[in-house]
């Protein structure tokens, strides 16, 4: 026997009190699938959240964050304060990146500058709070008489 509730479309619930007729979801609620016995309460985008998409009878509201904040978590479950480039968010608010670290975004943490010497390269452009260092050619590549551009090897003909 087919469950009569399976005939109830999205946007309705199967009303057990009324011989399982399909009743429209109450205001501020929705059902995104058919055959539901209750509707779900719409998400309310309040405070630092703002409405990106209104709730409808068949889909939940979607929130994003007011200017100066950015979304965190699945479905923008949290809003976190933006900082400036060159800063990171701490428990005490936005703080400048320490020397030797940088952040080129309004969110996230300060990261250490790239250590060019680990790749055998030299620092071409110094790092700042907002920008990573730019690594240049290795010191050996810059020795007198050395070309900084290696010409391509001549192509070999087949059979040689």
């Amino acid at each position: 026997l087919q469950d009569p509730c399976s005939n109830c479309p999205a946007g309705t619930f199967c009303d057990n009190n009324r011989n399982q007729i399909c009743s429209p979801c109450p205001p501020n609620s929705f059902s995104s699938a058919g055959g539901q016995r209750t509707c779900d309460i719409c998400r309310q985008c309040k405070g630092v959240f703002r409405t990106r998409k209104e709730c409808s009878s068949t889909s939940n509201a979607e929130c994003d964050c007011t200017p100066g904040f950015h979304c965190l978590g699945a479905g923008c479950s949290m809003c976190e304060q933006d900082c400036k480039q060159g800063q990171e968010l701490t428990k005490k608010g936005c703080k400048d990146c320490c020397f030797g670290t940088f952040n080129d975004q309004k969110r996230g943490i300060c990261r250490p500058w790239t250590n060019c010497s680990l790749d055998g390269k030299s620092v071409l452009v110094n790092g700042t709070k907002e920008r990573d260092v730019v690594c240049g050619p290795s010191p050996a590549d810059l020795s007198p008489g050395a070309s900084s551009v290696t010409p391509p090897a001549p192509a070999r003909e087949p059979g040689h």
Epitope: D15, P26, T38, D40, I41
Partner: nanobody
């Protein structure tokens, strides 16, 4: 026992007005989310208007915005629907309804009254 008794319906000409009343007993209107649903001949139920968030906000269906006004009198435990600029398509049985929030997070509603018939015709 929860009871909802609607009244105030009748026959009215297009462009006319009516005020529906819903006297509630067995619960306190001001502590609930309540509203009006209607059922036109041969059609399904439709939400018309509601007072939500314990009076913090109101809802109106697009088809009645600017023409219908929902209100309540907490002292009389009565819900009202003032209907003006009535149209033929407003013809329906109007029921007073109480939104029910279930422990698991689901939402349904209950309407216990017999409803009141509104007929808009010339």
């Amino acid at each position: 026992e929860v009871q909802l008794l609607e009244s105030g319906g009748g026959l009215v000409q297009p462009g006319g007005s009516l005020r529906l009343s819903c006297a509630a007993s067995g619960f306190t209107l001001s502590a609930e989310d309540v509203g009006w649903v209607r059922q036109a001949p041969g059609k399904g139920l439709e939400w018309v208007s509601a007072i939500l968030d314990h009076g913090g906000s109101t809802y109106y269906a697009e088809s009645v915005k600017g023409r219908f006004t929902i209100s309540r009198d907490n002292a009389k435990n009565t819900l009202y629907l003032q209907m003006s600029s009535l149209r033929a398509e407003d013809t329906a049985v109007y029921y007073c309804a109480r939104v029910i929030y279930h422990a698991g997070g689901g939402v349904t509603y209950d309407y216990r009254g017999q409803g009141t018939q509104v007929t808009v015709s010339s």
